[in-house]
Every structure is written in structure tokens, then in C-alpha cells.
Amino acid sequence: KEESSNQASLSCDHNGICKGSSGSLNSIPSGLTEAVKSLDLSNNRITYISNSDLQRYVNLQALVLTSNGINTIEEDSFSSLGRLEHLDLSYNYLSNLSSSWFKPLSSLKFLNLLGNPYKTLGETSLFSHLTKLRILRVGNMDTFTKIQRKDFAGLTFLEELEIDASDLQSYEPKSLKSIQNVSHLILHMKQHILLLEIFVDLTSSVECLELRDTDLDTFHFSELSTGETNSLIKKFTFRNVKITDESLFQVMKLLSQISGLLELEFDDCTLNGVGDFRGSDNDRVIDPGKVETVTIRRLHIPQFYSFNDLSTLYPLTERVKRITVENSKVFLVPCLLSRHLKSLEYLDLSENLMVEEYLKNSACEDAWPSLQTLILRQNHLASLGKTGETLLTLKNLTNLDISKNTFHYMPETCQWPEKMKYLNLSSTRIHSVTGCIPKTLEILDISNNNLNLFSLNLPQLKELYISRNKLMTLPDASLLPMLLVLKISRNTITTFSKEQLDSFHTLKTLEAGGNNFICSCEFLSFTQEQQALAKVLVDWPANYLCDSPSHVRGQRVQDVRLSVSECHR
């Protein structure tokens, strides 16, 4: 530990990583050596940075000063930080940004200036010397109102650019066009007024575009003022966006301009509508282009129970391969929609309200003909037998996740789609496993249940996940002749022997930590002498603790030594 000049303490490790966040520092500590590589002073009370404060820290690679109250940084404060790669000045009181701060930072890869009360990004191009910059975050929620053409000059490639333009009033055309390539652009905008102007400048340079916190209720698409159809955008995310039936139709028109769009995502959005997506101008049906993946999470639809016929969406879905609709209060997927999803290979309906009887309507005859993976985790399924029977229509289904549904009981026999290879029944409160489990399985996850016995013959099973149950022994290897992976941690297993392990002829990975091991002399000698064991036991030695004898309880099996007298009683 090194004491700073103003009596608050910093802790530095031998690698030069210094942490001093959430203290009462009111200036940058002066008593540190020049070996310091990382300095985290976030959430303190530093208001002023002088030219000399950081002068000696020539090896500094990361400087985090977020949430301090900094209102002044002297011109040459960062002049000695030629090795600095990470600078976080977010959520301070910097109302004027100076290019002289950043000029010396030739190694800078990450710069965060979010949440400071500046109106613009300064008088001159701030970032033109930062040739190695890869992640840039700028803007604020209220005072940042103007984006200028020179703001991003000199930046050619960014992995991530986040702009909080929540209250943007003015956008100078081509301001964002100067950056040739941005992997991921996050744009916060409350209003959509300038959206199309900005969008025009992004189509040929941004790969993933994320729009946040925007009210699109009154959005209307008008033809883009660009001849370019050569769009680089592959993924478009709407996060915390408000939308209506009509404006969703307008958004779809906008998206149809993006020729290479593959993925659409809606997170935490609100749809104020009843599912009438026709569009008031009776436009042609929108071509969904190449979109293959649609992800919807936590969609809020106030008028969900007044939803109309979704048939206007059906033609848009035929080429989609992957759909996720998670935590959005879905209780029924219309049969007709399921039938239109001809190319769908992956469907995730986690954390919804599906019951078997309504799932039957969704998985009707000819529904989801290409479906291979179905995830129904944490829905309202209650009968394993009914669930399997309901899904018999899905001829190509190989992977099924029905974890976190409450089944309790497993019938003696069940019917399943015949190609089933993967079944997840974890956290379903089942007490026993029966012949209901399909023999075709290669992977079975039944972790976190109430099982005290596993005696199923699964001739093709390669991976068994059975942690967090009440098993007292390893399963019988002869019942699982192809097993490669066995994860059986956090059960009540007291011991296992070399003979038991050897009987799993194909086993490559065993995870058996967190059990109640009786550290007998036999168990200790077997585990401590087998060097090869460490290769198989992936969680060895940390998770293997003795439960008894009492005097070694809590100690690692690897470390315990019993006396000669204890072993020769």
C-alpha cells in the first residue's frame, strides 16, 4: 500500500495496478513510483488536474478518472503519457474540450468522454492524432447539441463509437462519413428528427448500428438523399426505443434500404400498437432482404391482448433462420406464422408464458419445418409427456431446452421427435429420471434437480450434466458407454475409486468438485498419486475438499496427509 499526499490510501500490486476508487481523494496522488501502469481513481473528489500531476507516470497504460467532478485540465497534463492506452474522463464537469490534451497520447486505444457538459467536441479536431484509437465514447444527455464536420476528422477505423446525442439539435452533413469503418456505433437520440440525415452518412462505414432511447412513435421514412445502396450495415439494434404499428412499418422501409442487413435486434422496446403493420400509405410489402436473425428481448406491448392478425408480417419471415423472442409475455405463436417460418432453424422463446396446450397450436402440422433448436426455458410448461408429444410435428428438431419449467414428475415413457440429440431439463424440480428420456440423446443436462439416482441406459450419450443434485455415487459406466464429459459437482458423493473412473473408457472430462468427500487413506492415495487425474478432473484441486474426518474438514484433498496410524487401524 502506498499512502497518497492527502491521507487517502491507494493499493498497488506488484504489476503496477493501483486502485483508489470511491475514496475522498481531491487530487491525483503524488507519492507513486513511475512503475505505475494502471491507476483507477474513479468516484473521488478530484476537480483539477495540473501539468505536473501525471508528469512522472511515463509507464501509465490506463487512467480512470470517471465520476470525480473534474472541471479543469491544464493543457499539458497528459504530455508524458505516450504509453497511455486507456483514458476514462466520463461523468465529470468538463465543459470545454481541448485537443492539446490528446495530442501526446499516441498509444491511446480507448477514450471515454461521456457525460461531461460540453456543447460541442471543441473548436478543432480533437482526435486527429489518435491513430491507434479503437473505442471512443462522446456526448451527454442534455448539453451536447451539435455534431460538426471536423469532430471525427482523422479517425479511420474504430471498433466501437458511442455518441450520446440525446438532445441533438444540429448535425452537419458528412460529419460521421469521415470515419471509414466503425464496427459498432451506438447512437443515443431522444428524437428522430436528424436520424435520416445521420443514417445516410453511416450506411457505408458502420457494421453494427445501435439506436438507443429514441421515440420513433411519429417516425416517417422519406427517400434517402443518397444514391448509395452499397451498405455495410449487417446488424441494426433498437434499444429502449418507442414505436407504433405505423412507425414500425416506416422503420421496415428504412431497413429495406440496407442491402446487406443480416440481423435485427429489439431490446427493451415498447410497441404502442395492436399489430396492424400495413402502413397507412398502402405501400408494397417490404422486402426483408437478407435478414436471417431477429432478436427481441423484453418487448413491452401495452395492448398485447388487443393484437390483430399478424398476417402482414408473414411474408417477411420466410427467409429468417434464427429468432429469439425472450421475456416478452408470449403465450402463443400463431400456427400460420409457424408455417411461414420455413427457413427457421433456431427459435428461442425463453422466459415467456407458453403452456403445452397453446404450444400445440404453435407447433401445428407443417410448423417450423427446418427447426433444429428450440429453447423454451422458463415458460409455464408442466407436463414432460405432453411437451414431448406436442413437439412430434418438428421432424428436424435435434436440440431442446426446456429448463426452468416446473415438471416435478417424469412419466415412465414419453414420445419425442426422433432426431433429438440434446435435451436440457436443468432446474425443473424433477425427483427421478425414467425411460422418458430419449435414447437418441448425445447431450443431457439434468443439473439442479432433486435426483438421488441415475441408472438410465443411454447408449449414445457423450455429455452428462448432473451437478447440483443428491447423487451419492458416480453413475454406472456400463450404462453410458460413449460418455466423454461428466459434470457431477455439488452432489453428495463421498468417494470414487480408480476402478470406477477406469470403467468410463471414453471419459475425457470429469467435474466432481463440491461433493462431501470422505478422505479415507484409499481415496487420498488414489487422488494424490494419479498424475493423469488432473487432466480429467477439470476443477482439480480447488473444488475437492474433505468433509471428513472432522479434523481435515474443509481442506483440499490434494493437501491432506493422514498419519500412518490413521491409515493402519
Partner: antibody, heavy 118, light 111 residues
Framework: QVQLQQSGPELVNPGASVKLSCKAS????????INWVKQGPGQGLEWIGW????????NFNENFKDKAALTVDTSSSTAYMELHSLTSEDSAVYFC???????????WGQGTTLTVSS | DIVLTQSPASLAVSLGQRATISCRAS??????????MQWYQQKPGQPPKLLIF???NVESGVPVRFSGSGSGTDFSLNIHPVEEDDIVMYFC?????????FGGGTKLEIK
């Protein structure tokens, strides 16, 4: 097994407020909606509204929008309904019920009798 | 609001015979091929108990003598053969549109 245990009978003065509770057990509280239903003396059933414990979202019958407030405490798996500005019209048995499949009420509490009288 | 009209308000039946209770909705309660209509039984001093959901799906643990049918606006609950334990109140309920509404109830009586 699934259970919804409601708080005991209440006798309150007109104009006052009352908070009824519904403690859930035997299922994952945050996975299901909790509905509230009113049954006046010798009368039919009237849907008040629901709350989803996972995100706290609510939906109300317009007739009860200014009368009832729904909340949950996920740490104790308990749902609450507070009724305001009580009148004799509010005297009734109030049931909480678990909403399954987004559409049906498969488990009900035993009911709380509310009597509003001076 | 969708109004549910149950008929008759009371029905006298002989034990062992069939009882049919009707419920008519003021507009369709169809939702993409599923009728969002439920039936509940209520005994005196007890909460309602779910019998049928989605118009025809019998809730787990409910005796097979109970069945539901219908679509669109017209639904019925059938009990056959009627047992003494069934001589109580029955309510229909729709969850197609908010606010969810219940029928006025039908009281089963012994003839």
C-alpha cells in the same frame, strides 16, 4: 405444492386505505403473473388487474385504476394490493390468483374479506 | 369491454344426468385459432377453481366428467354424469381483451 396465502380479514373506516397481501410458495414467483379479483357479497367476479413480479409491469381494469395499486416484494415472494379512499362499495372478498399461460388463473388464494364500515 | 352472458342463471339437474351451461361473448374471443375462454367452479366460502382453459383444455386434476367446447362467441361447459359435489356455482371468463371479464355465474341445483 403451489400455494397463495392471503392476509386475514380487515375492518376499516370509510376514506381509509388498506394493504392486502398474498404470499406465494411452491413455484418460481417471478415467472408468473399475480392477478387480483373482487367478489362482492353474493355477487359475481370482477377482474381488478395483474402484476408481473419479474419486471413489475401492471395492467388494470379501468374501473380500478384509481382505486388499487399493485406491488410485489420478490425477496419474500409476496404480492400486495393497496386499496385507497375506501367506501362501503369496496366491501368484498378479494382474491389473488396465479396467472398461467398468460390467460388463465390456475391457483387462487383463499381470499381476504374487507369490510368498510364506520 | 367484452360482455359474457351465462345461461341459465340457475340449472336444476338430476344426479347422474348431463348438465350443460352456456356462455355467450359479445364479441369473438378467438386468438389465432385458440379460444381464450375459461370455466371456473366455486363452492361456498371457497375461491374459484379452474376447470377448463382455452375453451376445451381440461385442467390437470379435474375429473373427466367435465368438458368444454365452443369457439368464437359461443361456449359451453358440460358435466356428465353430474355428482352431488358438482352442485355449486360456475363462471366463464375471457382473456381475449382487457379488461378480462367473467360471466354472471350459473348455479347448479338438484332437481
Amino acid at each position: 405444492q403451489v400455494q397463495l396465502q392471503q392476509s386475514g380479514p380487515e375492518l376499516v373506516n370509510p376514506g381509509a386505505s388498506v394493504k392486502l397481501s398474498c404470499k406465494a410458495s411452491g413455484f418460481t414467483f417471478t415467472t408468473y403473473g399475480i392477478n387480483w379479483v373482487k367478489q362482492g357479497p353474493g355477487q359475481g367476479l370482477e377482474w381488478i388487474g395483474w402484476i408481473y413480479p419479474r419486471d413489475g409491469s401492471t395492467n388494470f381494469n379501468e374501473n380500478f385504476k384509481d382505486k388499487a395499486a399493485l406491488t410485489v416484494d420478490t425477496s419474500s415472494s409476496t404480492a400486495y394490493m393497496e386499496l385507497h379512499s375506501l367506501t362501503s362499495e369496496d366491501s368484498a372478498v378479494y382474491f389473488c390468483a396465479r396467472l398461467t399461460g398468460g390467460t388463465f388463473l390456475d391457483y387462487w388464494g383463499q381470499g381476504t374479506t374487507l369490510t368498510v364500515s364506520s | 369491454d367484452i360482455v359474457l352472458t351465462q345461461s341459465p342463471a340457475s340449472l336444476a339437474v338430476s344426479l347422474g344426468q348431463r348438465a350443460t351451461i352456456s356462455c355467450r361473448a359479445s364479441e369473438s374471443v378467438e386468438y389465432y385459432g385458440t379460444s381464450l375462454m375459461q370455466w371456473y367452479q366455486q363452492k361456498p366460502g371457497q375461491p374459484p377453481k379452474l376447470l377448463i382453459f382455452g375453451a376445451s383444455n381440461v385442467e390437470s386434476g379435474v375429473p373427466v366428467r367435465f368438458s368444454g367446447s365452443g369457439s368464437g362467441t359461443d361456449f359451453s361447459l358440460n358435466i356428465h354424469p353430474v355428482e352431488e359435489d358438482d352442485i355449486v356455482m360456475y363462471f366463464c371468463q375471457q382473456s381475449r381483451k382487457l379488461p378480462w371479464t367473467f360471466g354472471g355465474g350459473t348455479k347448479l341445483e338438484i332437481k
